[in-house]
């Protein structure tokens, strides 16, 4: 089917945020199963970070399959910005501050911080590099700013303002937006190339975060980590700028991206995860 559709995409001058999902099945590849029915279903695409349509065969498959776009969005996406702004202005912590620390299903372990609701403090844990949840911060300071109570009953919100616990008045502080909104690529893009454990010599690409470029490497065929792409284009899309077009003045623009409708089984680059 060569029918094409045009898709409007919001483009920002910043990189994509880390991928943090509530459910690990949202990372599964779309699976039409072995049967031959033609059923319209929806799945969450970890590369575009959107719920998209696919054709389901009617049997087997996996949990990344939803009857409606709304159900898919409900299970696999979060309106993070709105949720944070809303809860902060109500002088509450964002709800994700109360989630248990979640290392995710990958194994490129890196230091992150989470808010421990029992101790009421931000603490260190080891994050596997993909999925997990939003109670996951790159710095102790960012975690404290978003989830910890400030001194004297003040709660610091995410736009550099303090909420006065007594009369709810807003006191301007720093105008710096915290790094939750300083979008950057998926955290697995920071992991080193990992050949894996097998003996094949497959041509793959990984994102070198030091030089900011995608570079080739030889993949053994199994294991490794998610910083592993079958093409340079896919590597750049996931780790460099995605569908991002740099614009000198920053801000938002709309661009058009043409994409063929897919009527066959979706085949992504392999994503290497720990066995569930």
């Amino acid at each position: 089917d060569s029918e094409e559709d045009e898709e409007h995409t919001i483009i920002t001058d910043t990189e994509l945020p880390p991928l943090k999902l509530m459910h690990s099945f949202c990372a599964f590849k779309a699976d039409d199963g072995p049967c031959k029915a033609i059923m319209k279903r929806f799945f969450f695409n970890i590369f575009t970070r959107q719920c998209e349509e696919f054709i389901y065969g009617g049997c087997e498959g996996n949990q990344n399959r939803f009857e409606s776009l709304e159900e898919c969005k409900k299970m696999c996406t979060r309106d993070n910005a709105n949720r944070i702004i809303k809860t902060t202005l109500q002088q509450e912590k964002p709800d994700f501050c109360f989630l248990e620390e979640d290392p995710g299903i990958c194994r490129g372990y890196i230091t992150r911080y989470f808010y421990n609701n029992q101790t009421k403090q931000c603490e260190r844990f080891k994050y596997g590099g993909c999925l997990g949840n939003m109670n996951n911060f790159e710095t102790l300071e960012e975690c404290k700013n978003i989830c910890e109570d400030g001194p004297n009953g003040f709660q610091v919100d995410n736009y550099g303002t303090q909420l006065n616990a007594v009369n709810n008045s807003l006191t301007p502080q720093s105008t710096k937006v915290p790094s939750l909104f300083e979008f950057h690529g998926p955290s697995w893009c920071l992991t080193p190339a990992d050949r894996g454990l097998c003996r094949a010599n497959e041509n793959r690409f990984y994102y070198n975060s030091v030089i900011g470029k995608c570079r080739p490497f030889k993949y053994s065929g199994c294991g490794g980590n998610e910083n592993n792409f079958t093409s340079k284009q896919e590597c750049l899309r996931a780790c460099k700028k995605g569908f991002i077009q740099r614009i000198s003045k920053g801000g938002l623009i709309k661009t058009k991206r043409k994409r063929k409708k897919q009527r066959v089984k979706i085949a992504y680059e392999e994503i290497f995860v720990k066995n569930m």
Epitope: E100, D102, Y113, K126
Partner: antibody, heavy 118, light 112 residues
Framework: EVQLVESGGGLVKPGGSLRLSCAAS????????MSWVRQAPGKGLEWVST????????YYADSVEGRFTISRDNAKNSLYLQMNSLRAEDTAVYYC???????????WGQGTLVTVSS | DVVMTQTPLSLPVTLGQPASISCKSS???????????LNWLQQRPGQSPKRLIY???KLDSGVPDRFTGSGSGTDFTLKISRVEAEDVGVYYC?????????FGQGTKVEIK
């Protein structure tokens, strides 16, 4: 005073199973990630597994992944290690340890000896 | 995995004299957050391990100040300014920067 008391060790044949327990007291158990570390006779220490505060998520050493399962019951202030398909090389004293806010082990139990032998 | 190498493996010392144990890691222990998660444990004969020092140089509560930790990157040192009888045992360095956590082979401190 923080106290961690392990139990459940003993002699088991290769391929057998054993379940270790660690009873915690003197601190709010549910506030801390917990770990198991082992020490083979006359040898050094080896990290085995860690579990998050609420018990939903786990980490394992490659040497035990797929064979050992760490779990916890916060209501009972208890940590567990279910060990299946045991091998001679799993023979060791097993310690439970608490993880502090830096994700570092700060308090250790007295250990329980697991011997895998035919 | 990060390999931790301690020297010496055996350290006979005279009571009241200083002692020094070296610990080297196969890669830097400086984490992305700017902290270095290098720690020292003491295991007295027949006892379980006890944490002495964390984050290179911070002493745990109740640890005598004759113990000091220092170092950065890949090279670290534990010093005992004046060895006492109760200091006899095995000392382990271990790193909590990279996963999995790994330990040194241990240094046995004994009285001459």
């Amino acid at each position: 005073e923080v106290q961690l008391v392990e139990s459940g060790g003993g002699l088991v044949k290769p391929g057998g199973s054993l379940r270790l327990s660690c009873a915690a007291s003197g601190f709010t158990f549910s506030s801390y990630a917990m770990s198991w570390v082992r020490q083979a006779p006359g040898k050094g220490l080896e990290w085995v597994s860690t579990i998050t505060t609420g018990g939903s998520y786990t980490y394992y050493a490659d040497s035990v992944e797929g064979r050992f399962t760490i779990s916890r019951d916060n209501a009972k202030n208890s940590l567990y290690l279910q060990m299946n398909s045991l091998r001679a090389e799993d023979t060791a004293v097993y310690y439970c340890a608490r993880q502090d806010g830096n994700f570092l082990m700060d308090y250790w139990g007295q250990g329980t000896l697991v011997t895998v032998s035919s | 995995d990060v390999v931790m190498t301690q020297t010496p493996l055996s350290l006979p010392v005279t009571l009241g004299q200083p002692a020094s144990i070296s610990c080297k890691s196969s890669q830097s222990l400086l984490d992305l957050d700017g902290k270095t998660y290098l720690n020292w444990l003491q295991q007295r004969p027949g006892q379980s391990p006890k944490r002495l020092i964390y984050l290179v140089s911070k002493l745990d509560s109740g640890v005598p100040d004759r113990f000091t930790g220092s170092g950065s990157g890949t090279d670290f040192t534990l010093k005992i300014s004046r060895v006492e009888a109760e200091d006899v045992g095995v000392y382990y360095c271990w790193q909590g920067t990279h996963f999995p956590f790994t330990f040194g082979q241990g240094t046995k401190v004994e009285i001459k």
